[in-house]
Interface confidence: low
């Protein structure tokens, strides 16, 4: 397949990735699905540099990322290893808090108002960030 050479319209390029920043809110699963339909995924933060880039663009607003523990352990949606990877949780987070009264714990991670991460109820309608890699092979069939 061919490789992308530039980001789609309305996406922002940074370090060979393309990012799209929502201005509305969705539950985590709906945000995840939105990104997948764009041939992308919810943002996966792998470095402090990427953290600062995303933080700069979202501002002080709760925003979903591609990290969840809905099936037990914390997992990034693109398969990046959580245990050995970059983390930027707020103090005492994640805490899988049950005290919110909405049923269940907190299984989805988001950027908080200061950029650090928190786990929250996945049904909350937060903004989200999609990411796709520029050098990812496109989904078009190869030319024969």
């Amino acid at each position: 397949g061919s490789e992308r050479t530039c980001c789609p319209v309305n996406w922002v390029e940074h370090e060979r990735s393309c990012y799209w920043f929502s201005r509305s809110g969705k539950a985590w699963a709906d945000a995840d699905n939105y990104c997948r339909l764009e041939d992308a995924h919810l943002v996966v933060v792998t470095s402090w540099e990427e953290q600062k880039f995303v933080q700069h663009h979202i501002g002080p607003v709760n925003t979903w990322m591609g990290l969840h523990d809905q099936n037990g352990p914390w997992k990034w949606v693109d398969g990046t290893d959580y245990e050995t990877g970059f983390k930027n949780w707020r103090p005492e987070q994640p805490d899988d808090w049950y005290g919110h009264g909405l049923g269940g714990g907190e299984d989805c991670a988001h950027f908080t108002d200061d950029g650090r991460w928190n786990d929250d109820v996945c049904q909350r309608p937060y903004r989200w960030v999609c990411e796709t890699e520029l050098d990812k092979a496109s989904q078009e069939p190869p030319l024969l």
Partner: antibody, heavy 121, light 107 residues
Framework: QVQLQESGPGLVKPSQTLSLTCTVS??????????WSWIRQHPGKGLEWIGY???????YYNPSLKSRVTISVDTSKNQFYLKLSAVTAADTAVYYC?????????????WGQGTLVTVSS | EIVLTQSPDFQSVTPKEKVTITCRAS??????LHWYQQKPDQSPKLLIK???QSFSGVPSRFSGSGSGTDFTLTINSLEAEDAATYYC?????????FGGGTKVEIK
């Protein structure tokens, strides 16, 4: 430094509605991630949590008081409110407003000074 | 709801003595247990959050431990200004609840 100040009538007649205001200064009540609670303390007794409110207006009330309690917010005034209906002498207490630590599970890190409300005819 | 049982209800202690207050939860709350100090005619003040983390500005003689259902607040080398009532509070399950309090008096 966030500060909280309760205000309202110190005397309420039985069967009437108790109404209190908590004014927040030194920080915005709209700061996403904070919960704002009402807690009361009967004379010489322990603490009883009444309920909380998120800046968006979502609330959760103690089931023991749920049928009589309303907590609301006015973000433009940086205030939140407690209404407790059909009061009896058993509602005589010091009423505190308090701020929960970031993201709801860090304990109450800031309290008002409290206001005594007496229910009597 | 989660019931928090504090013991003892009352403790009379001489200065420089060690004070231990326990709080037992009726079901597991992980580390979502906090301790407050309340002096007469004052509002409660947060001392320890998350069972063992000192809140900012709290003297180092105050410490907390425990998880699950059993928690302890320790005051090492009690000072006269520590005369107060101490409350535990759980935030792990709704409704939020408090222990009944432990009054510490200076002999």
């Amino acid at each position: 430094q966030v500060q909280l100040q309760e205000s309202g009538p110190g005397l309420v007649k039985p069967s009437q509605t108790l109404s209190l205001t908590c004014t927040v200064s030194g920080g915005s009540i709209s700061n996403s991630g904070y919960y704002w609670s009402w807690i009361r303390q009967h004379p010489g007794k322990g603490l009883e949590w009444i309920g909380y409110m998120y800046y968006s207006g979502s609330t959760y009330y103690n089931p023991s008081l749920k049928s009589r309690v309303t907590i609301s917010v006015d973000t433009s005034k940086n205030q939140f409110y407690l209404k407790l209906s059909a009061v009896t002498a058993a509602d005589t207490a010091v009423y505190y407003c308090a701020k929960g630590g970031y993201n709801w599970n860090n304990g109450f890190d800031c309290w008002g000074q409290g206001t005594l409300v007496t229910v009597s005819s | 709801e989660i019931v928090l049982t504090q013991s003892p209800d009352f403790q009379s202690v001489t200065p420089k003595e060690k004070v231990t207050i326990t709080c037992r939860a009726s079901q597991s709350i992980g580390s979502s247990l906090h301790w407050y100090q309340q002096k007469p005619d004052q509002s409660p003040k947060l001392l320890i959050k998350y069972a063992s983390q000192s809140f900012s500005g709290v003297p180092s003689r105050f410490s907390g431990s425990g998880s699950g259902t059993d928690f302890t607040l320790t005051i090492n080398s009690l000072e006269a200004e520590d005369a107060a009532t101490y409350y535990c509070h759980q935030s792990g399950r709704l409704p939020l609840t408090f222990g009944g309090g432990t009054k510490v008096e200076i002999k």
